[in-house]
């Protein structure tokens, strides 16, 4: 014969679990519904009734399968100084990041705790890696035959272009020039950007140091060494 | 309401150091960046670094890194700069400041330490 | 390190006055600048964040404007009571750097 289906609440085996979506509780010593996200356990579970649940009030939320007897409160307004990249809802907090052209180089445990802006690359160097919502920007030196002669946390290095005769040739900060005669190939106009990054919630890790125009944090443990400032051409 | 308390006046000899400390209360301890920031008599105001006791980061201006060691006491929300080797320059009012915000512009400054260096 | 320059250390004013204070930086800071009042015995007050956003109680004949590396803290009617040091400071990067201060004298 197939096994009865247990409907909560009902008593676990001896030794068993609740099942998923369950929990025990202890008062009632029974196995008895969690409430689905963006609800919250209004009245407990007895022996004879199970958990009877309602939505969260406005500004309160949960995120998991839960018998809490309160939603969580979301977070308080987004400062004008940050954005709100995930709204408040019955089922997930606010989420504020940094503005555009910072990231967050310190995270707390909801949102962010400081933000740095973005490392510029300068002149003769590319970027490498795009920046995120929770890491700095990588710059890298352009490669022979690339150059970049912008100041910029988003222009990776372009390729020079190719003249019939070279007036004077590129470097990794400026492009090739070519005598009156038109080139064979050439770039589009205008610096090539990579795009915005999308949100992200990768771990910040330190990059490695590269030439900048802004100094990024860096970080030590209380009893360190001092490491020198991350990629800073200084003032 | 946020406040931060630091401790009194301190008169000590050249050479010597000096322990510092500012008492957070009104927020939860580890969700805020500590800084410190020296103002010597007469003059403006320099930011010396920052203790983040939410994990124990800390960030020195690399004109202080030999002077200052940032700790703290979570137990008592209090952080604490300790000044080594202490010259007549060392002699300043001393502040802790907090910001709310993820970026650092001080919204809270404690009331200030004054240091006196002499012999 | 970014320098900041108020390059008046004093300034003299009347009540009623409107008044000026200047602060250069030693490159683009992304109008990342505070401006801090100080009275003699007292910590420093924030006043003006990310160039004109006036902290909370900030009464609003305090006034920032700027861009690039020139930043000015207006005052639109001088009050008595702002005789004062101010401090310009950016929040763009590590390490943090304050301007010299202009003392704001009344006549």
């Known amino acids: 014969l197939p096994a009865q289906v247990a409907f909560t609440p009902y008593a676990p085996e001896p030794g068993s679990t609740c099942r998923l979506r369950e929990y025990y509780d202890q008062t009632a010593q029974m196995c008895c519904s969690k409430c689905s996200p963006g609800q919250h356990a209004k009245v407990f579970c007895t022996k004879t009734s199970d958990t009877v649940c309602d939505s969260c009030e406005d500004s309160t939320y949960t995120q998991l399968w839960n018998w809490v007897p309160e939603c969580l409160s979301c977070g308080s307004r987004c400062s004008s100084d940050q954005v709100e990249t995930q709204a408040c809802t019955r089922e997930q907090n606010r989420i504020c990041t940094c503005r555009p052209g910072w990231y967050c180089a310190l995270s707390k445990q909801e949102g962010c705790r400081l933000c740095a802006p973005l490392r510029k690359c300068r002149p003769g160097f590319g970027v490498a890696r795009p920046g995120t919502e929770t890491s700095d920007v990588v710059c890298k030196p352009c490669a022979p035959g690339t150059f970049s002669n912008t100041t910029s946390s988003t222009d990776i290095c372009r390729p020079h272009q190719i003249c019939n005769v070279v007036a004077i040739p590129g470097n990794a900060s400026m492009d090739a020039v070519c005598t009156s005669t038109s080139p064979t190939r050439s770039m589009a106009p205008g610096a090539v950007h990579l795009p915005q990054p999308v949100s992200t919630r990768s771990q910040h890790t330190q990059p490695t140091p590269e030439p900048s125009t802004a100094p990024s944090t860096s970080f030590l443990l209380p009893m360190g060494p001092s490491p020198p400032a991350e990629g800073s051409t200084g003032d | 309401k946020v406040q931060l308390q630091q401790s009194g006046a301190e008169l000590v000899k050249p050479g010597a150091s000096v322990k510092l400390s500012c008492k957070a209360s009104?927020?939860?301890?580890?969700?805020?960046?500590i800084h410190w920031v020296k103002q010597r008599s007469g003059q403006g105001l320099e930011w010396i670094g920052w203790?983040?006791?939410?994990?124990?980061?800390?960030n020195y201006n690399e004109k202080f890194k030999d002077k200052a060691t940032l700790t703290a006491d979570k137990s008592s929300s209090t952080v604490y700069m300790e000044l080594t080797r202490l010259t007549s320059e060392d002699s300043a009012v001393y502040f802790c400041?907090?910001?709310?915000?993820?970026?650092?512009?001080?919204?809270?400054w404690g009331q200030g330490t004054t240091l006196t260096v002499s012999s | 390190d970014i320098v900041m320059t108020q390059s008046h250390k004093f300034m003299s004013t009347s009540v009623g006055d409107r008044v000026s204070i200047t602060c250069k930086a030693s490159q683009d800071v992304s109008t990342a600048v505070a401006w801090y009042q100080q009275k003699p015995g007292q910590s420093p007050k924030l006043l003006i964040y990310?160039?004109?956003t006036r902290h909370t109680g900030v009464p609003d004949r305090f006034t920032g404007s700027g861009s690039g590396t020139d930043y000015t803290l207006t005052i639109s009617s001088v009050q008595a009571e702002d005789l004062a040091l101010y401090y310009c400071q950016h929040h763009y990067s590590t390490p943090y750097t304050f301007g010299g201060g202009t003392k704001l004298e009344i006549q």
């Open positions: 203790f983040y006791p939410g994990s124990d980061n800390i």
């Open positions: 400041a907090s910001h709310e915000g993820p970026y650092v512009y001080f919204d809270y």
């Open positions: 009104g927020y939860t301890f580890t969700e805020s960046i």
């Open positions: 990310w160039t004109s």
